[in-house]
């Protein structure tokens, strides 16, 4: 409920400074509090706008202060208005000159419908003039000058709501400046009744509290609190929760408190008089000192709180045995709470006697929304109310109030909530590499939207189109490898950031999809790579018989060793060879192959081959003749790669013989690099030539080698190979 209080200090204006202070206690109004002149109550009052300022001593309070020189402009009726969530509350009051001819008995008077009412004004100045009485600025009654009594009264035998208003009294020759004002408030209902049709019964509003005719709630006088106003506040405090304090040396002296209708205005407990500057007489207490102490066991009567009961007694007159009531206290509530947006379960914990019940504990949001506990439990000493806010958001940041209202009193504790935005990555993670059962991911956790610091990061993943829960792994580095994935499966990936505090898991960021590779087919078997021409190579393999129905093809990759030249060729799966053409002569190529379906197969080992040469081959090099015996010798040599050398020919003859008497030994395997000549004659000199053949022709030996066999009985000899020019 909105707690709006108007303090009129002082209603009787003399030469002293006077003020109006309007306090929104324990709530934050959506719109500013306004203080204005109440022209409804009094039309012909001063028109000057009011100079309304912020009351620096309170967070939500406005003030109007009149200096003594402005006294002539003050007389009249005023209001203070506060609004929250569409509900407006207006509190009215008046100010009048202390030197007025008449003074009212009270500033306001609250009566029930049907009551027998006397509105009275005390004559202060005696004049030989008629007295006149006005209601809301309109003349209603006059008293001839010789009949003006000491107490001027307006009698209403059966007060009705339409009788309510501001009544003023003055002499006929006077004016607004010399008028006395009192406001009559007539409850719409008869005594103890409330409701639109006034046929519900009020609860008892103790200590001069007033039952609100629309809601049945008690409006408690300044200095009392609780559902039935039974509990006295601490000394010099007021407000629905007694958390406002009178700062004067003598507490609330000279403060007239005005509350929403039908309460009206009264002094704080312990004070009486139009200016609230008179202390209660002994035996009396409460607002305007209207309450009489009737303490049962001779207990002391305190003018502020009433009977001060001995231990073991309670009640207004200490008439009930029992543990004395203890005002509730809110405990273990920090001044500041940082909360992550989303679900929030604030806890209010309170002590007191009787222990607060769940309906007596509430939580008030900064916008004035009142929340009730979702869960409640209590121990011997504490009540714990757990509230649930399903979705708290940054606009909910601000001052929240835990409020406890029991028969023993009311207490409120404001605390600040700072709602943080959960972090969420702006970018989807990137897939760096994949295999059939793994993926390498860059999680791209920054930049992110929302509040840090980031406490931890999770990489979430799951197969697409599977009704599986997301799996996740905690991540510390930006690069992470996901293992044990299913082959040939589309996955979804996203990153979730976690900030400190409960519920700090942010929404997962954008999703990236990727597909793992299939487990590939084995490479073709029986691969063979042979040159076909100077510009072609021929790759062959055994026929492929796939294990599944899937279409397949052979992918052949060939690349040049000498140049950065690569080509991939797709070959229908029913073929067993491919001609690799447009190659360069005398160039080495590396070739590999694999069998692909929708998934890629495993590559074969590399095969290497040269295209056929476009020039004659060079002579074999490093020719050596060794292990010479009387009838044999070993010839060794090396050849250069890349010239398509297909065979080596060794030609030898006895020196001095004719050319046509030579012997040719043709070695058709070009990989053989040595050969043993046999059947030679002992102690004979031979001329040996060696040359290479390729697709173009034979190499041209530059010189011949000499070989001399040993006598029959001699050990083998090595010759450096003497050179003999032809």
């Amino acid at each position: 409920a909105m707690d709006l209080i108007l303090i009129n200090s002082l209603p009787l204006v003399s030469d002293a400074e006077t003020s109006l202070t309007c306090i929104a206690s324990g709530w934050r109004p959506h719109e500013p509090i306004t203080i204005g002149r109440d022209f409804e109550a009094l039309m012909n009052q001063h028109q000057d706008p009011l100079e309304v300022t912020q009351d620096v001593t309170r967070e939500w309070a406005k003030k109007v202060v009149w200096k003594r020189e402005k006294a002539s402009k003050i007389n009249g009726a005023y209001f203070c208005e506060g609004r929250v969530r569409g509900e407006a509350i207006r509190i009215r009051t008046m100010k009048m000159r202390q030197q007025a001819s008449f003074l009212p008995a009270t500033l306001t008077m609250t009566v029930d419908k049907g009551d027998n009412v006397n509105i009275s004004f005390k004559k202060v100045l005696i004049k030989e003039e008629d007295a006149v009485i006005y209601k809301n600025g309109s003349f209603i009654h006059s008293v001839p000058r010789h009949e003006v009594p000491d107490i001027l009264e307006v009698h209403l035998p059966h007060a009705q709501p339409q009788d309510a208003g501001v009544y003023s009294a003055r002499y006929i020759g006077g004016n607004l400046f010399t008028s006395a004002f009192t406001r009559l408030i007539v409850r719409r209902c008869e005594a103890q009744k409330w409701g639109p049709e006034c046929n519900h019964l009020c609860t008892a509003c103790m200590n001069n509290g007033v039952c609100h005719e629309d809601t049945g709630e008690c409006i408690c006088p300044p200095g009392f609190m609780g559902r039935t106003c039974e509990k006295a506040c601490e000394l010099h405090t007021f407000g629905r929760t007694c958390k406002e304090r009178c700062s004067g040396q003598e507490g609330c002296k000279s403060y007239v408190f005005c509350l929403p209708d039908p309460y009206g205005c009264s002094c704080a407990t312990g004070w009486k008089g139009l200016q609230c500057n008179e202390a209660c007489h002994p035996g009396f207490y409460g607002p305007d000192c209207k309450l009489r102490c009737s303490c049962n066991n001779g207990e002391m009567c305190d003018r502020f709180q009433g009977c001060l009961c001995s231990p073991g007694w309670q009640g207004l007159q200490c008439e009930r045995e029992g543990i004395p009531r203890m005002t509730p206290k809110i405990v273990d509530l920090p001044d500041h709470i940082e909360v992550n947006s989303g679900k929030f379960n604030p806890i209010c914990k309170a002590s007191g006697w009787p222990l607060p019940t769940n309906e007596e504990m509430t939580l008030v949001k900064p916008d004035g929304t009142v929340l009730h506990p979702k869960d409640f439990n209590h121990t011997d000493h504490f009540s714990v109310a757990i509230f649930t806010i399903h979705r708290i958001l940054p606009p909910d940041s601000g001052v929240w109030v835990c409020s406890v209202n029991t028969v023993a009193g009311m207490v409120e504790k404001p605390f600040n909530i700072s709602v943080k935005v959960l972090p969420k990555p702006l970018n989807a993670p990137n897939v760096i590499d994949t295999g059939h059962n793994f993926a390498v991911i860059n999680i791209s956790s920054e930049p992110y939207f929302g509040d840090g610091p980031i406490k931890s990061k999770k990489l979430l993943y799951k197969p697409v189109n599977h009704y599986e829960a997301w799996q996740h792994i905690q991540v510390t580095n930006e690069i992470v490898t996901l293992n044990y994935l299913e082959p040939r499966t589309e996955y979804e990936l996203c990153v979730q950031l976690v900030r400190r505090g409960e519920g700090g898991e942010g929404h997962p960021g954008p999703v990236r999809r990727f597909t793992t590779a299939s487990i590939g087919l084995p490479p073709p078997r029986g691969l063979n790579l042979l040159p076909k021409s100077q510009t072609t190579l021929n790759l062959t393999w055994q026929p492929i018989f796939p294990s599944s129905e899937d279409d397949f093809y052979v992918e052949v990759e060939r690349r040049s060793v000498q140049k950065s030249d690569q080509q991939n060729i797709k070959v229908p799966g029913n073929l067993t060879s491919v001609l690799l053409n447009n190659l360069h002569p005398r160039e080495q190529y590396v070739v590999r192959a694999r069998v692909n379906t929708k998934a890629q197969g495993e590559w074969s080992e590399d095969l290497t081959a040269w295209t056929l040469s476009d020039i004659l081959p060079p002579q074999p090099e490093n020719i050596k003749i060794s292990n010479i015996t009387h009838s044999s010798a070993v010839i060794s040599w090396t050849i250069l790669d890349g010239y398509s050398i297909s065979s080596i020919t060794i030609r030898y003859k006895v020196q001095g013989k004719n050319e046509d008497q030579h012997v040719d030994v043709k070695i058709k395997n070009a990989t053989i690099t040595q050969y043993q000549l046999k059947g030679l004659e002992p102690e004979t000199a031979y001329q040996v030539d060696i040359f290479a053949e390729n697709n173009i022709g034979s190499s041209n030996p530059a010189f011949s080698h000499e070989l001399v066999t040993l006598p029959e009985s001699q050990a083998p000899a090595d010759l450096g190979g003497g050179k003999m020019l032809l």
Epitope: E87, G195, N199, H200, C202, T203, A204, D214, T228, G315
Partner: antibody, heavy 117, light 113 residues
């Protein structure tokens, strides 16, 4: 905790009388108006009577007016319903309740009255 | 007296689904002076007394889960359970307190489909 504990139910013949009681604890009983509400077997709720906090004002449903009397003893935190000239249609579970404004906030556990010959 | 009529008399709703109970008064229970609707909702489980859920038509009583919400004004009101739970199986009553005597609707039995 606020509690309302009821007693006094039973089986009674038509035309006879019965007295129901409701003992309150955990609240300042003398500050609250109190209600009686009844519920016939398998039927809805029917308000019966209310009494003001000081016992000065009492109101009754037309169906029980002149036969039932609501009363309270604030010194004992006790609410009563004296039921005379009972009829078969008075057979019901009777509840005492405290109001929150015009809604009924705290209810007793209920007591069964069976009017049968 | 103000008559209160609820509809439907009984209602079967699947768990997790929305349940809606209507209440109609024979005259307006909206008081124009404070713009409040003088209407309450109760839940009653077998063998238990009624439990206050809502007052002023839409103010949730403390301890009542926020899946319960009240709406409407004047003569037509609705109690909504946004996501039905097993423990919500009960009879629900509306009650006006605009005028004495306070009167209740005949009740709506809510079951799980």
């Amino acid at each position: 905790q606020v509690q309302l504990v009821q007693s006094g139910g039973g089986v009674v013949q038509p035309g006879r009388s019965l007295r129901l009681s409701c003992a309150a604890s955990g609240l300042t009983f003398s500050n609250y108006a109190m209600h009686w509400v009844r519920q016939a077997p398998g039927k809805g709720l029917e308000w019966v009577a209310v009494i003001s906090y000081d016992g000065e004002n009492k109101y009754y449903a037309d169906s029980v007016k002149g036969r039932f009397t609501i009363s309270r003893d604030n010194s004992k935190n006790m609410l009563q319903l004296q039921m005379n000239r009972l009829r078969s249609e008075d057979t019901a579970v009777y509840y005492c309740a405290t109001p929150k404004g015009g809604a009924l906030e705290i209810w007793g556990q209920g007591t069964v009255i069976t009017v049968s010959s | 007296d103000i008559q209160m009529t609820q509809s439907p008399d009984s209602l079967a709703v699947s768990l997790g689904e929305r349940a809606t109970i209507n209440c109609k008064s024979s005259q307006s229970v909206l008081y124009s002076s404070n713009n409040k609707n003088y209407l309450a909702w109760y839940q009653q489980k077998p063998g238990q007394p009624p439990n206050l859920l809502m007052y002023w038509a839409s103010t949730r009583e403390s301890g009542v889960p926020d899946r319960f919400s009240g709406s409407g004004s004047g003569t037509d009101f609705t109690l909504t359970i946004s996501s039905l739970q097993a423990e919500d199986v009960a009879v629900y009553y509306c009650q006006q307190y605009y005028s004495a005597p306070i009167t209740f609707g005949q009740g709506t039995r809510l079951e799980i489909k």
